[in-house]
């Protein structure tokens, strides 16, 4: 089989600080040295890029400085963290993995992780 399987949790609940973490694991059909990981958000039929990082196997993921994502890698497993989430960001987050080098190129698309974000209740004013 030439397809690359990508596994990710079905559901994740963001913390009260708007941080959600999940693992994206891929079964590599080849021995890749350069991998690109992208987090996509799917709302209805619209798919948008949340963040992306390219890394050399054995090295750390490097997201852009202004990215809302951070992550670490270990073998064929990537630990992703998305920060600054609000209730309106609740949705399906898809992990996309591309084995860029060496040839052949492989694409792997996860089924998506439904991230639920609940905005914290504002603290009531104290009457002391």
């Amino acid at each position: 089989c030439k397809a690359m399987h990508v596994a990710q949790p079905a559901v994740v609940l963001a913390s009260s600080r708007g941080i959600a973490s999940f693992v994206c694991e891929y079964a590599s059909p080849g021995k890749a040295t350069e991998v690109r990981v992208t987090v996509l958000r799917q709302a209805d039929s619209q798919v948008t890029e949340v963040c992306a990082a390219t890394y050399m196997m054995g090295n750390e993921l490097t997201f852009l400085d202004d990215s809302i994502c951070t992550g670490t890698s270990s073998g064929n497993q990537v630990n992703l963290t998305i920060q600054g989430l609000r209730a309106m960001d609740t949705g399906l987050y898809i992990c996309k993995v591309e084995l860029m080098y060496p040839p052949p190129y492989y694409l792997g698309i996860g089924n998506g992780t439904q991230i639920y974000v609940i905005d914290p209740e504002p603290c009531p004013d104290s009457d002391f």
Partner: antibody
Amino acid sequence: EVQLVESGGGLVKPGGSLRLSCAASGFTFSSYTMHWVRQAPGKGLEWVSFISYDGNYKYYADSVKGRFTISRDNAKNSLYLQMNSLRAEDTAVYYCARGGHLGPFDLWGQGTMVTVSS
Amino acid sequence: EIVLTQSPATLSLSPGERATLSCRASQSVGSSYLAWYQQKPGQAPRLLIYGASSRATGIPDRFSGSGSGTDFTLTISRLEPEDFAVYYCQQYGSSPWTFGQGTKVEIK
């Protein structure tokens, strides 16, 4: 408007060269992989070449390897295909296509005709 | 290289009829990586179905895709006059990206 517009096609003699361009607009060009696909007259679609987001990685069909070179300029939102040592069998309509976020070619240009004949 | 074989080469049907197009892969293709395109004369291809069964934006629900592994199907439930065209399947899970040879749906 989200679109791709190819240019640079024309008539060229066997052994000659041609450079195709594809101008992208209406989307963040650097966030997508790009491809060239061709279609010989009356024939089906044939994938020609792929280029990664930053242009670091390129793949080619065996039929054009060593003769064609794909490149991109993200600052200019442009994709290119340099075609050298052209043969009669390279005669085709050449399309640039966007590799969508989920993989399929979700946006195509209108195509540019390349004719290789003496 | 994954070879895609489409059948039949030509399908002659009348408007209102159901069209069933087949695409068979030489080796297993993950269902997430199979697409269908429509092409009309003088026009660029248009994405219809991706991930074997998901309709692209703006595609009418009379188009549906199914299948997994090596066998995939595109179904047009009731042919409209504008549906007569050539249809291609494609795998995009690994390089080289490959297309089937196409099925022409023509008016009977």
